[in-house]
């Protein structure tokens, strides 16, 4: 025997208390598939969330974050505060990257500078809070007889000393 509710399209629910007729989803709710017995509640984009896409009877609202925040989690389930480049977000707010680390984005954590010597290379440009070091040719490449290389510019001051 065919389920009479299977005829109810997306945007409706099968209303058993009204002889299984297909009733439209109530305001602020949706059903994205047919045959549903109850419509789902639309997501509300409140506070630091803002509406990227309005809810319709067949699809949920989509949220993003207000300026100064960015999305985290599936479907932007959380908004996290932005920091400046050269900082990371801690429980106490945005903090500068410690010496030897950098962050070139407004989100995420400070990461250690690349260790050029692990690849047998030299430091071409020193790192800062905002930028990783730039590795240059290996010291062997700079030995007499090797093809000429423009000597690196004087190293900039390291970006940040420990506080």
């Amino acid at each position: 025997l065919q389920d009479p509710c299977s005829n109810c399209p997306a945007g409706t629910f099968c209303d058993n208390n009204r002889n299984q007729i297909c009733s439209p989803c109530p305001p602020n709710s949706f059903s994205s598939a047919g045959g549903q017995r109850t419509c789902d509640i639309c997501r509300q984009c409140k506070g630091v969330f803002r509406t990227r896409k309005e809810c319709s009877s067949t699809s949920n609202a989509e949220c993003d974050c207000t300026p100064g925040f960015h999305c985290l989690g599936a479907g932007c389930s959380m908004c996290e505060q932005d920091c400046k480049q050269g900082q990371e977000l801690t429980k106490k707010g945005c903090k500068d990257c410690c010496f030897g680390t950098f962050n070139d984005q407004k989100r995420g954590i400070c990461r250690p500078w690349t260790n050029c010597s692990l690849d047998g290379k030299s430091v071409l440009v020193n790192g800062t809070k905002e930028r990783d070091v730039v590795c240059g040719p290996s010291p062997a490449d700079l030995s007499p007889g090797a093809s000429s290389v423009t000597p690196p510019a004087p190293a900039r001051e390291p970006g940040h000393s420990p506080q």
Partner: antibody, heavy 118, light 108 residues
Framework: QVQLQQSEAELVRPGASVKISCKAF????????INWVKQRPGQGLDWIGY????????TFNRKFKDKATLTVHKSSSTAYMELSGLTSDDSAVYYC???????????WGRGTVVTVSS | EIVMTQSPATLSVSPGERATLSCRAS??????LAWYQQKPGQAPRLLIY???TRATGIPARFSGSGSGTDFTLTISSLQSEDFAVYYC??????????FGQGTKVEIK
């Protein structure tokens, strides 16, 4: 027979977590939302949230958003609620209840007593 | 959130008499209101939904009325099994769905 069968009473320590279950019989599990409702001793009813077993979509009462996690296991027609960071305020009877149509509750489990005590 | 207020807190009625229970919403909930009965040690049971529609198997002595903010549950002739706590619940618009604090109907 159409019913919701809930897990047995739980005695848990403060700070711990507990996961209680609600097994559906006699109807197609994915057709109906499963809601969870809290009732403190001698108190009224407090709606926690629901899960739609069809698509795992959840909606919460904001005050329980960080307290309760709702999941389902479709093949066994079972819904679960995990409560974390338990305190004495979480000692209560927890009911699962089915929704049909608009969001009233036409079928209830018998309740699971959760007692938080050291 | 919408606050539901029930009155009276306790209603003392003799068997066979009429009982009238009131539920008021802090803002309009249209007709999106349900009534439940709860006996000691038991789960609530749906009596009325959409303000006035009796749920399956509920006797005709139970009736509901009202819309907007003011609602009434009437038990026309109280039977011994009707002595219990009654809750109203709104399910209008946005969650959280909220319940009244309950009215206890006791034997006079």
């Amino acid at each position: 027979q159409v019913q919701l069968q809930q897990s047995e009473a739980e005695l848990v320590r403060p700070g711990a977590s507990v996961k209680i279950s609600c097994k559906a019989f006699g109807y197609t599990f994915t057709n109906h939302h499963i809601n969870w409702v809290k009732q403190r001793p001698g108190q009224g009813l407090d709606w926690i949230g629901y899960i739609n077993p069809y698509n795992d979509y959840t909606t919460f009462n904001r005050k329980f958003k960080d307290k309760a996690t709702l999941t389902v296991h479709k093949s066994s027609s079972t819904a679960y609620m995990e409560l974390s960071g338990l305190t004495s305020d979480d000692s209560a009877v927890y009911y699962c209840a089915r929704t049909w149509g608009h969001w009233y509750f036409d079928l209830w489990g018998r309740g699971t007593v959760v007692t938080v005590s050291s | 959130e919408i606050v539901m207020t029930q009155s009276p807190a306790t209603l003392s009625v003799s068997p066979g008499e009429r009982a009238t229970l009131s539920c008021r919403a802090s803002q309009s909930v249209s007709s999106n209101l349900a009534w439940y009965q709860q006996k000691p040690g038991q789960a609530p049971r749906l009596l009325i939904y959409d303000s006035s529609t009796r749920a399956t198997g509920i006797p005709a002595r139970f009736s509901g009325s009202g819309s907007g903010t003011d609602f009434t549950l009437t038990i026309s002739s109280l039977q011994s099994e009707d002595f219990a706590v009654y809750y109203c619940q709104q399910y209008n618009n946005w969650p959280p769905w909220t319940f009244g604090q309950g009215t206890k109907v006791e034997i006079k």
